[in-house]
Every structure is written in C-alpha cells, then in structure tokens.
Interface confidence: low
C-alpha cells in the first residue's frame, strides 16, 4: 500500500504592486499532479508580519490571495498543498511547507524617518495628515507623501503640503471617493544631499478618524417646574445622527459641573427654583455603530441662560 | 417590521458546497448592516460572516476564510452565503442577521450580539 503524497506549490511569492502595503501572495499547482486530475486541489496559506505572535491562516482554490501588510517591518508567508480525503481514499494529506519573505531594504536610521504622524478625517469630509521632521535631519530634507486604498489604480502624491521653513510637515488631501470602510495606506518618504532618509508606512481606516464638527443651535425648554430639557441639533455635514455620541457639560450658578454621555440630542436635567444660572456645551463624537474609534469634536458654543425666573416656556439665546 | 427568511440549506458531503439566501423585507432604511449566524447542535451563537449595504466591506470569521463568501443584491433585497469546502465542523443552524443601526461590521467574534433582526434560521449537515 504506497504512501500518497503531494508535493508543495511552485513558485511562490509576495508581489509589491507598489500600493504602499497591500500585498499580493501568489504560487503554481505543484508538480506531479497528474494522479489526482479528478481532484480539487486545495492550499493552506500562512502570513504574519515578522515579529507577530499569530498566523493569518486561510484554505483557497485559487493560485492567490491579497491582504495589507505593514512596510515597516517584514513579510513572511508560507503554503503548503492539501488534497482533501475524496482524493486519497482516507484522511487529508498535505505536502510540506513552501515558504517565502518580502521586506523593504531599509534605507537611514530610523530617526530620520518622519515623527509623530497624526491623520484626522474633518467632519467625514476633509483628511489631513501632519508630522514632525526627523530628529537630526538637516533643513534640506524634505517628505513626500504617497497613499493609496482599494479603487485608486496606482499610489498617489500628495498635492497640497503644509510647508513650515520650506519643508513638507503634511498633507491635505483631496476629495477622497469611497474611501472609507476600508484600509488607507500612507507611506512618507523623504530625500537629503547629505544622508538616505527612512521611510514610514501608515494603515487606518477613515471612518476610525474621524472628527466631526461640533454641535450648534443650543437651546433650552422648560418641561415642569424641576426638569429643563437641553436641545441641540447636529453639524452640518455628511454624518447621520444615527452616528453620533454627545458629551455634555452643564454648569448650573457657577458650582455645580454636570457631565453626561448621551446617544440623543437632548439631554433632560433636574433643576431647583434657586436655580438663576444655567450654562452647557456640548461636543460630538462618531459612535460605535459607525466606527470602531474617534476623535470628540471641539466643544460647542456655550450656551447660557441668566434671570430671575427660569419657568418661562423656552429660554432661547 | 423586519422580515427575515432563510433557505438553502440541507444535507452535505464533506468537501461539498451549498448557497445560503436570505431574503429581507420591510425595512425602510438603506444603510445597514446584514450577516450569517450560526450555532452549533449543542454550542453556543458563532459569528460567521458580515456585509455592509452601503460600502464593499465584507468580514469572515477565522473559521471560514477562503471557503465561504458573503454577498448581496440590493435589488431583490438578498443575501447570500457562498459555502465550499464544508468540513463537519460547520454543521449548524445558521442564522440571518440584520442591524440597521450600523453601517460598517465590526471585525470583533462577539458582534452577533448587537444584530437587531433574525431570521428563523435554516440547518446545514455536513456528513458522509
């Protein structure tokens, strides 16, 4: 009773298109596999970034597969051939490992590369992104950006920099089409006459990022004798309400400091009839049925209501 | 009031494949989030597969990367479930699932729990 085996994939590889992080993954049929034309070959692909303690493992059909990476550390990926056991009268077989690595030469120390990258996507609409020059690099150095997410067909430059002594210090980017809910990718590179300058490589998803402005048209209701109902109305912009957390600060006679996270634009509050001052503000974040992080807005304006008598139906300013 | 109905399930080899669909009704809202369920004989809910109807974005769980796909068609208002390979281990019954407060699917093993809408459910057996 011979041993079936099977021998692993060919050619296998990690192929840069040049999208800053995205990857593809891509092998051939193994050898000799003419015993098993009645079957459907499959693979079992294993990929991690160097250094991370877990595999991504995925089983294909198909001669490749994509995913994002990130460019500042190493790729390393291997593939091994399974024949299922409709193929082999029994259990699984599979062959041994094919295993490859993909990694950027760096180029510079690491100081040189760009520091303290921050990215904020302004109400949903408008991405900007800023860092600060390497430590120790001269003044002739200067960063270039390049980013790209699923449906540009090559890396793109930046067009607008923000500029501080003549050098590149962000970027404000371009209307950015169907670009969120999925992986953007940045890479700022840079050049110097006097030293190579080391790369940096970014992933985030913009919706993650997102700053919305900050709430307007504040106003107040009076709903019984102890209850004013606090109001707001959403920024205007391409966010639904649906998306939004509000945090409220309300100050009542200049003591007390009331703070509350509501889902809703309104906010009842319990008050007293010694109550001669009321002030509140509000601020605005995307919440997690949108994203999965962000960033609070800037607080409202603050609204205020002063006077002997705050019974009065509505108090509006 | 959401109306969820699955079907295509049914008997399997292992190394098989079925379709799942689900097709949805009564909902007036267009963004939303819609995914697939399942629960083992015995087990506890296990997320398998989540889609967005405004954005491309489509999650797996670890367990059915690069065998099952999920998909949709606005116009007939249906989801699908594409699943190749069947091991044993995905006999479940398997659960149509719609949020209409998220737009995007958490990449997270416990969202199942935030889905606001189910279907009855449809089993799938794979056995030889």
């Known amino acids: 009773d011979t041993e079936i085996k099977v021998n692993p994939p060919q050619d296998f590889e990690i192929v840069d298109p040049g999208y800053l992080g995205y990857l593809y993954l891509q092998w051939q049929p193994p050898l000799s596999l003419d015993h098993f034309k009645e079957c459907t070959v499959e693979y079992e692909l294993k990929y991690r970034n160097i250094g991370s303690e877990t595999w991504k493992t995925i089983i294909t059909k198909n001669l490749h597969y994509k995913d994002g990476f990130d460019l500042n550390k190493g790729i390393e990926a291997k593939i091994h051939t399974l024949l299922p056991w409709q193929c082999t009268n029994g259990s699984e077989v599979q062959s041994s490992w094919a295993e490859t690595t993909y990694w950027i030469s760096p180029q510079g120390i690491p100081e040189t590369k760009v520091q303290d990258m921050d990215c904020v996507y302004y109400n949903w609409q408008y991405l900007l992104c800023s860092w600060k020059p390497g430590i120790g690099v001269l003044l002739d150095t200067n960063y270039n950006l390049f980013y790209w997410y699923e449906g540009l067909d090559h890396a793109l430059q930046c067009v607008d920099y923000i500029k501080a002594d003549g050098q590149n210090i962000g970027c404000r980017f371009p209307y950015l089409e169907a670009s969120d809910y999925k992986d953007f990718y940045i890479c700022v590179n840079g050049s110097s006459e006097n030293k190579p300058i080391r790369s940096s490589y970014f992933t985030f998803q913009l919706q993650n990022i997102v700053k919305p402005l900050p709430p307007v048209y504040l106003t107040f209701t009076r709903e019984s004798s102890c209850e004013i109902k606090l109001k707001w109305s959403i920024p205007l912009g391409p966010i639904p309400a649906r998306c939004f957390d509000y945090e409220i600060e309300i100050r009542e006679d200049d003591t007390t400091l009331v703070t509350a996270t509501v889902e809703n634009e309104t906010y009842t509050l319990k008050t007293t009839n010694e109550t001669r001052q009321l002030c509140f503000v509000v601020r605005s974040k995307v919440n997690i049925y949108c994203s999965d992080d962000g960033i609070w807005s800037e607080w409202s304006d603050k609204q205020c209501w002063e006077g002997e008598d705050l019974s009065k139906k509505t108090l509006l300013r | 009031e959401v109306q969820l109905v699955e079907s295509g399930g049914g008997l399997v080899q292992p190394g098989g494949s079925l379709r799942l669909s689900c097709a949805a009704s009564?909902?007036?809202?267009?963004?939303?989030?819609m995914g697939w369920v399942r629960q083992a004989p015995g087990k506890g809910l296990e997320w398998v597969s989540c889609?967005?109807?405004?954005?491309?974005?489509?999650y797996y769980a670890d367990s059915v990367k690069g065998r099952f796909t999920i998909s949709r068609d606005n116009a007939k208002n249906t989801l699908y479930l594409q699943m190749n390979s069947l091991r044993p281990e995905d006999t479940a019954v398997y659960y149509c699932?719609?949020?209409?407060?998220?737009?995007?699917?958490?990449?997270?093993?416990?969202?199942?729990?935030?889905?606001?809408?189910w279907g009855q459910g449809t089993l799938v057996t794979v056995s030889s």
């Open positions: 699932a719609m949020d209409s407060r998220r737009v995007t699917c958490p990449e997270i093993s416990t969202m199942h729990r935030n889905f606001d809408s």
């Open positions: 009564g909902f007036a809202s267009d963004d939303y989030i």
């Open positions: 889609i967005s109807s405004r954005y491309a974005n489509t």
